[in-house]
C-alpha cells in the first residue's frame, strides 16, 4: 500500500510537470506562430495589422501582451466605451504592454491640422516608426476605462534619451475639449508637463487641466491663439513648456514662436527633438508571465 | 485706441479701506489677464497683483497678500483693487496694466492713481 | 523671489552717446525679460518684449539682447526725449520683479 501511494505521488509530479511544460510549449507555438505571421516587421515590409482573429477584444495593448502577444507591432484594440475597434501600435518592449497614443520620428506627417483630425486621429498606422496622433476620442475612451500611466519616451539629435512618467493620465471628453489631467511625476526628462520646474510659473507654464486647442478650436488662456502660432493641436497654456506635436526641427531651429517639439525642462525652447514616443500602460500593470 | 483709464486719487487713514478702478476699452477685456503695480513717492515700481482673464486665478506680492483683493467685471470690462488695512508703506501711485503676450509682458498702462495713507 | 540687478544705477550721457544698460537675474528667465521707460510724473512705457523684441511705435535706437541672465538695453544714439528712467522687468514668474532701475540723465 505505501509503495502504491509513494507512485500515485510520483505520477502525480510527473503529471504536473508535464501540464506545465505543456503550458510553456502553447505559450511557446503562440509566440511562433505571431512571429511567424509578422516576421516581415523587422524586415522593414510593415504595412499590416497583426491579426489576432476574433477570439476577443482587447482594451488596450497590456490585455494583448498579457494574453501572451510578446511581439511590438500594429494590433486592433477597442476600449470598453469605444464604438469601433481601431488599430494602434503597441510596443511590447519596456516591459511591455504600453499602447502608442503619438509618435514623432522624422517629420513626415504634418501635425498642423484641425480639431476633427486631432478628434480622430490622423497619421501613418502601418510603419513600426510611423507618426501618428492616436485621437483624443480615442484617448478619452482609453484613459476613462482604468487609471493610466503616461510614459514619454524623448531622444535628441545628439543620441541621448531621455523620459518623463505621469500616473493618472486623463483626456477628458468633447464636452470638456479633450482636457488633460497627469498626476505624480517621474523620470529623467524633467516636469514639462504640469510646469513644476519653478513654483511661480504654473500659470502660464503647467499644461494640467488644459483644454485641447487646434488652430480652428481656440481653448487656451492666452489672448492670442497658441495653435495657430505654434502650428499643432496640444493642451496649450500661454502657450507651453512642452509640445511634442510642434513642427519638426532638426535639433536647434529659430523661428517666430518656440513652434519646434519641445520640453522645456531638458532642451528648453530652442530644440526641436528628434523622437518621440507618448504611451500608455495600466497604473497596476503587472505582466502575465505564464 | 487701447485705453486703461483709473479712478481718482485719493487719501486714506491708517487701517482704513479702499477699491481702486481701472476700465478698459478698445480691446475685448476679457481675453487678457491684468495686474497692479505700484510705486512709492521716489521709489521704483513693485507689482502688487494679477487676475487671470477669468478671474479664476489671482496671485499677490507678499506685501499686500491677505490685505489687497484683485477682481474684475468683464461686463464692465473693469478691473479692482479692494485695498483693506492700509498702511503707511501703502502710499503709491497705483497703476493698471494689461499683461500682454507670450512672455507676458505689461502694455499697455493705466495713468495711475495717487494713495495717500496717512492720519 | 527672482532679483533683477541694473547697472548703473544712474548715468550721465550727451545727445547722440551711445547708452548701455545691463540687467542681471538672480535665476534663468529664458527670455522673459522686458523693459520699459518711464518719464517723471508718467506711467511707464514698453520699449521691449521678450528681450529682445521692439514694441510697435518704438524708435529703432533702442534694441535689446540677451537670454538666460544677463540681458542688456542698448539705446544707439540718445535723443533728447531719451533722459528717463529705465526698468527691467521679469515675467518668467508670476511674482513679477522690476530691476531698481537706471536714471539716465543729461551730461
Known amino acids: 500500500l505505501e509503495d502504491c501511494a509513494q507512485e500515485q505521488m510520483r505520477l502525480r509530479a510527473q503529471v504536473r510537470l508535464l501540464e506545465t511544460r505543456v503550458k510553456q510549449q502553447q505559450v511557446k507555438i503562440k509566440q511562433l506562430l505571431q512571429e511567424n505571421e509578422v516576421q516581415f516587421l523587422d524586415k522593414g515590409d510593415e504595412n499590416t495589422v497583426i491579426d489576432l482573429g476574433s477570439k476577443r477584444q482587447y482594451a488596450d495593448c497590456s490585455e494583448i501582451f498579457n494574453d501572451g502577444y510578446k511581439l511590438s507591432g500594429f494590433y486592433k484594440i477597442k476600449p470598453l466605451q469605444s464604438p469601433a475597434e481601431f488599430s494602434v501600435y503597441c510596443d511590447m518592449s519596456d516591459g511591455g504592454g504600453w499602447t502608442v497614443i503619438q509618435r514623432r520620428s522624422d517629420g513626415s506627417e504634418n501635425f498642423n491640422r484641425g480639431w476633427k483630425d486631432y478628434e480622430n486621429g490622423f497619421g501613418n498606422f502601418v510603419q513600426k516608426h510611423g507618426e501618428y496622433w492616436l485621437g483624443n476620442k480615442n484617448l478619452h475612451f482609453l484613459t476613462t476605462q482604468e487609471d493610466y500611466t503616461l510614459k514619454i519616451d524623448l531622444a535628441d539629435f545628439e543620441k541621448n534619451s531621455r523620459y518623463a512618467q505621469y500616473k493618472n493620465f486623463k483626456v477628458g471628453d468633447e464636452k470638456n475639449f479633450y482636457e488633460l489631467n497627469i498626476g505624480e511625476y517621474s523620470g529623467t526628462a524633467g516636469d514639462s508637463l504640469a510646469g513644476n520646474f519653478h513654483p511661480e510659473v504654473q500659470w502660464w507654464a503647467s499644461h494640467q487641466r488644459m483644454k485641447f486647442s487646434t488652430w480652428d478650436r481656440d481653448h487656451d488662456n492666452y489672448e492670442g491663439n497658441c495653435a495657430e502660432e505654434d502650428q499643432s493641436g496640444w493642451w496649450f497654456n500661454r502657450c507651453h513648456s512642452a509640445n511634442l506635436n510642434g513642427v519638426y526641427y532638426s535639433g536647434p531651429y529659430t523661428a517666430k514662436t518656440d513652434n519646434g517639439i519641445v520640453w522645456y525642462t531638458w532642451h528648453g525652447w530652442w530644440y526641436s527633438l528628434k523622437s518621440v514616443v507618448m504611451k500608455i500602460r495600466p497604473n497596476d500593470f503587472i505582466p502575465n508571465v505564464i | 485706441e487701447v485705453q486703461l483709464v483709473q479712478s481718482g486719487g485719493v487719501v486714506v487713514q491708517p487701517g482704513g479701506s479702499l477699491r481702486l478702478s481701472c476700465a478698459a476699452s478698445g480691446f475685448t477685456f476679457d481675453d487678457y489677464a491684468m495686474h497692479w503695480v505700484r510705486q512709492a513717492p521716489g521709489k521704483g515700481l513693485e507689482w502688487v497683483s494679477l487676475?487671470?482673464?477669468?478671474?479664476?486665478?489671482?496671485y499677490y506680492a507678499d506685501s499686500v497678500k491677505g490685505r489687497f483683493t484683485i477682481s474684475r467685471d468683464n461686463s464692465k470690462n473693469t478691473l479692482y483693487l479692494q485695498m483693506n488695512s492700509l498702511r503707511a508703506e501703502d502710499t503709491a501711485v497705483y497703476y493698471c496694466a494689461r499683461n500682454s503676450g507670450r512672455r507676458n509682458w505689461f502694455d499697455p498702462w493705466g495713468q495711475g492713481t495717487l494713495v495717500t495713507v496717512s492720519s | 523671489d527672482i532679483q533683477l540687478t541694473q547697472s548703473p544705477s544712474s548715468l550721465s550721457a550727451s545727445v547722440g552717446d551711445r547708452v548701455t544698460i545691463t540687467c542681471r537675474a538672480s535665476q534663468s528667465i529664458s527670455s522673459y525679460l522686458n523693459w520699459y521707460q518711464q518719464k517723471p510724473g508718467k506711467a511707464p512705457k514698453l520699449l521691449i518684449y521678450?528681450?529682445?523684441s521692439l514694441q510697435s511705435g518704438v524708435p529703432s535706437r533702442f534694441s535689446g539682447s540677451g537670454s538666460g541672465t544677463d540681458f542688456t538695453l542698448t539705446i544707439s544714439s540718445l535723443q533728447p526725449e531719451d533722459f528717463a528712467t529705465y526698468y527691467c522687468q521679469q515675467s518668467y514668474s508670476t511674482l513679477w520683479t522690476f530691476g531698481q532701475g537706471t536714471k539716465v540723465e543729461i551730461k
Open positions: 521678450a528681450a529682445s
Open positions: 487676475i487671470s482673464w477669468d478671474g479664476g486665478s489671482t
